[in-house]
Amino acid sequence: IIPVEEENPDFWNRQAAEALGAAKKLQPAQTAAKNLIIFLGDGMGVSTVTAARILKGQKKDKLGPETFLAMDRFPYVALSKTYSVDKHVPDSGATATAYLCGVKGNFQTIGLSAAARFNQCNTTRGNEVISVMNRAKKAGKSVGVVTTTRVQHASPAGAYAHTVNRNWYSDADVPASARQEGCQDIATQLISNMDIDVILGGGRKYMFPMGTPDPEYPDDYSQGGTRLDGKNLVQEWLAKHQGARYVWNRTELLQASLDPSVTHLMGLFEPGDMKYEIHRDSTLDPSLMEMTEAALLLLSRNPRGFFLFVEGGRIDHGHHESRAYRALTETIMFDDAIERAGQLTSEEDTLSLVTADHSHVFSFGGYPLRGSSIFGLAPGKARDRKAYTVLLYGNGPGYVLKDGARPDVTESESGSPEYRQQSAVPLDGETHAGEDVAVFARGPQAHLVHGVQEQTFIAHVMAFAACLEPYTACDLAPRAGTTD
């Protein structure tokens, strides 16, 4: 199965020489970035990137690891330290505060410094930190948020919200005491904290009053509105902008993205999180790639540029379920969105960053043969004389004992999209991991992305590259032909 050309040292020497030649040609651009795009793979640790690369190759009938992901082509790479102020292993709220606002916070808080305490409403005021997206808007750029989760979820919320509890999606989730103290739910903050030009993802139910049927699932009360304040937040948002459009399905999205009269676009395609890519109804729900393209079509109309946050948010969910198939297929769709964005933008004026908020206790090992399925079995047997998969989790719901023993596994079982990889420790949900994650960079000022950095560095690189606060005196040449 080993390609015969790989047996020849010339193959490797030639390949490395080409890579070296490309590296020698790299010239740090001294220009400012007109546009900023941050691609956030939620839970996309390095083991996830590697496994997804192999899967992407194998889907194209290749052996796997020699394949390039779109993110692999980014010329600059750093490592990001993801810990939060209070935890070695963080959540998506504290990390969003770090890479979007440039300040580390506490576990499960969003858009607040570490002086704020989880779930304590009265520690909110005065501890708010401002996102790069907010700063980009103040500088006259258009801004957008695209995610496969709820748009009120922890990662996207880092761009616009300030909350001591990431779970306060709608006012129904906020305790009465916190509401009385003036703490607002994330959905309310989405439409009131700042003017976001493009909002695409899931999360319809948090925008409407309880008793409002969902347009896609009108007979399912569990998918209907959840709000208790009587507000229709979509209606309120539409009233703020003359060119605003709300859509809830793929067809409407594609139409709206091509309509020159649309200046603001909100697309909410599921009541909660969007469906996994493998379960997506392609007639009703857009893919992450399609949402990214739609966002770029609208945002790129602004001559002053744009800021765009794009999240592959359900990589994380697949891992929490210990279903590597789901996590890896989500990662591939995320990578497809990165590739499409690269085709629609220029690295001359657009700084693109790809990173993860945190990793997962997801491992890839066992000496599998080159070309063997990423979802397959390791050669040989374990000490209990049973097979084991090359993908495993340190903890999670894949832990099963049958008659006091670990169950055996076959290749056909492990290849199923529903299969949960085994783990060493039984938990309802697999946990995040604390190791550093990669940051990939391309475009103006991408060369700043180097070494091992705090996760907060990412926000500062973006702000500096686009000459946003606090780096308005960035002393970078505007890109030739930039209009103001």
Epitope: A172, P175, P209, M210, G211, T212, Y221, G224, G230
Partner: antibody, heavy 116, light 111 residues
Framework: QERLEESGGGLVQPEGSLTLTCTAS?????????MCWVRQAPGKGMEWIGC???????TWYASWAKGRFTVSKTSSTTVTLQMTSLTATDTATYFC?????????WGPGTLVTVSS | IVMTQTPSSKSVPVGDTVTINCQAS????????LGWYQQKPGQPPKLLIY???TLASGVPSRFKGSGSGTQFTLTISDVECDDAATYYC????????????FGGGTEVVVK
């Protein structure tokens, strides 16, 4: 199969206390649910007691129940109803219910008899 | 909130139509947070209609809910013997004291 089951009912002395437990199976409160208690005196209608929202542990009650009855979430699958200063008028079948509007899942009920 | 249900009892021949009314003391939440439940002896209630007019899963279309704000109606057409039960309306107003309530119930006897 999603189910609710009440336990802890029985005979209690006037002015006594009792705690009823509602155990969920087939789902857990790691997702947010409204969990309510409703009672029905023999031959009478349904009477709402109070609810808890498991997403943030907010509780609210009927005015007649406030102070004497307490709804709590005790685990990811159990909710309790603590009742104090019971009188004969509290004799009823007590139902645990999931949902607020609508209630979509009911337990079979547990009978509480207050008598000396 | 207080829910007043009328009539308290109704006798109806098989095949006829029965109408049950429910009045809220004030507008319920979103004007539609009202449910109708059917209870048979020895059993917990069963959801029939939610959000005033939406038929619950598995419930025959003979059951119809209507109304908004404070006035609501449950209509059972082509009544069958199996429809003999007590019917309750339940309204939700707010997540505060006395924010939910059941109506007094209507016993439907099928002749």
């Amino acid at each position: 199969q999603e189910r609710l089951e009440e336990s802890g009912g029985g005979l209690v002395q006037p002015e006594g206390s009792l705690t009823l437990t509602c155990t969920a199976s087939g789902f857990s409160f790691s997702s947010s649910y409204y969990m309510c208690w409703v009672r029905q005196a023999p031959g009478k209608g349904m009477e709402w007691i109070g609810c808890i929202y498991t997403g943030n542990d907010d509780t609210w009650y009927a005015s007649w129940a406030k102070g004497r009855f307490t709804v709590s979430k005790t685990s990811s699958t159990t909710v309790t109803l603590q009742m104090t200063s019971l009188t004969a008028t509290d004799t009823a079948t007590y139902f645990c219910a999931r949902g607020l509007s609508p209630i979509d899942l009911w337990g079979p009920g547990t009978l509480v008899t207050v008598s000396s | 909130i207080v829910m007043t249900q009328t009539p308290s009892s109704k006798s109806v021949p098989v095949g006829d139509t029965v109408t049950i009314n429910c009045q809220a003391s004030e507008s319920i939440y979103n004007n539609n947070n009202l449910g109708w439940y059917q209870q048979k002896p020895g059993q917990p209630p069963k959801l029939l209609i939610y959000w005033a007019s939406t038929l619950a899963s598995g419930v025959p279309s003979r059951f119809k809910g209507s109304g908004s704000g404070t006035q609501f109606t449950l209509t059972i057409s082509d009544v069958e013997c199996d429809d003999a039960a007590t019917y309750y309306c339940a309204g939700y107003k707010s997540r505060t004291t006395d924010g939910s309530a059941f109506g007094g119930g209507t016993e439907v006897v099928v002749k």
